[in-house]
Interface confidence: low
Amino acid sequence: SEVEYRAEVGQNAYLPCFYTPAAPGNLVPVCWGKGACPVFECGNVVLRTDERDVNYWTSRYWLNGDFRKGDVSLTIENVTLADSGIYCCRIQIPGIMNDEKFNLKLVIKPAKVTPAPTRQRDFTAAFPRMLTTRGHGPAETQTLGSLPDINLTQISTLANELRDSRLANDLRDSGATIRIG
């Protein structure tokens, strides 16, 4: 079942998703989509990375972390009630049916008072590939022996410390972690 994350209207929402490249630069394609993860790919793609870069993104959707180190957590800027719903983070591991799929439920609450649209304090550039703020690591590891030996050591959906402290009380921690190889 999906983990639930919350934000208020006008704030930035944060949906954590991590994998750890076995080595720098050895990236795995990732897609984010609106709606639960389908059998293949992502539906209603809002952002996509390839082996080197963020190659597709839509307005208001950003990677605010070090995606080159596997922090592919999604930030949705200035959310509205329409942003509520399930989001899919899909780590597209090479091989047949090897993808890791994470469904994250975003609940948008009406603002107590209507705030002016705000940006997170570390929102430092106009393009996601230039944003390099770090997160922190997973809480536990679960070993899987049946996956292929690829250059990828860990995948996790972990509620990292938020860059935006206003959301901190609304975020529920998740410790789902997968180690490969």
Epitope: P21, P24, G25, N26, K69
Partner: antibody, heavy 125, light 108 residues
Framework: EVQLQQSGPVLVKPGTSVKMSCKAS????????LNWVKQSHGKSLEWIGV????????TYNPKFKGKATLTVDKSSSTAYMELNSLTSEDSAVYYC??????????????????WGQGTSVTVSS | DVVLTQSPATLSVTPGDSVSLSCRAS??????LHWYQQKSHESPRLLIK???QSISGIPSRFSGSGSGTDFTLSINSVETEDFGMYFC??????????FGGGTKLEIK
């Protein structure tokens, strides 16, 4: 000031194991990958492997798979390398070295900007 | 594996000379080539990263150039403190960083 302080020299017998340490200071330990590099006497450098202190993820040079095991202790900002089944071929100086934290879509590789002072391992009966 | 060949193996120079050290890769490594200096009984020190990018604290007389398979480290007006070993390293090929065999810069 960034520093990597390695444990002292060791003399060990063939067939045994040794575990050396690399204590990091002066930066956020989990923000940089840590490499281990071997330098045999009078020879060039060999990359052993890299560990991500963020979560313990590792990648090894195939030559050193099964020979070296890399771990970290985040609470003490210390990285460790254990070498097993030691032979005279393992006699060398071993360095830990921090990856340059450099992000730009033009580059995929990393350099090593800070190095420990090295740990000398001598394997002899 | 990517093999890095450094030449010459030994370079004898007089302080004040300008020198070039070569590093050739067995296949293209883009700009993922780095240079290190190692003095006797010391740890390696990063001089140049990504072919030509300078490193804070490294004298400006050190510079790098090249791309693909052929790379050069240049030292403009060698000083006595520059003598030692120089290694190139590639980080384009995973899961293996590789180093060149080294060039020894010695006083003539």
């Amino acid at each position: 000031e960034v520093q990597l302080q390695q444990s002292g020299p060791v003399l060990v017998k063939p067939g045994t194991s040794v575990k050396m340490s690399c204590k990091a200071s002066g930066y956020t330990f989990t923000d940089y990958y840590l490499n281990w590099v071997k330098q045999s006497h009078g020879k060039s450098l060999e990359w052993i492997g890299v560990i991500n202190p963020y979560n313990g993820g590792t990648t090894y040079n195939p030559k050193f798979k099964g020979k070296a095991t890399l771990t970290v202790d985040k609470s003490s900002s210390t990285a460790y390398m254990e070498l097993n089944s030691l032979t005279s071929e393992d006699s060398a100086v071993y360095y830990c070295a921090r990856d340059v934290d450099y992000f730009d879509n033009k580059y995929v590789g990393y350099a090593m900007d800070y190095w420990g002072q090295g740990t000398s391992v001598t394997v002899s009966s | 594996d990517v093999v890095l060949t450094q030449s010459p193996a030994t370079l004898s120079v007089t302080p004040g000379d300008s020198v070039s050290l070569s590093c050739r890769a067995s296949q293209s490594i883009s700009n993922n080539l780095h240079w290190y200096q190692q003095k006797s009984h010391e740890s390696p020190r990063l001089l140049i990263k990504y072919t030509s990018q300078s490193i804070s604290g490294i004298p400006s007389r050190f510079s790098g150039s090249g791309s693909g398979t052929d790379f050069t480290l240049s030292i403009n007006s060698v000083e006595t403190e520059d003598f030692g070993m120089y290694f190139c390293q590639q980080s384009n090929s995973w899961p293996q960083y590789t180093f060149g065999g080294g060039t020894k810069l010695e006083i003539k």
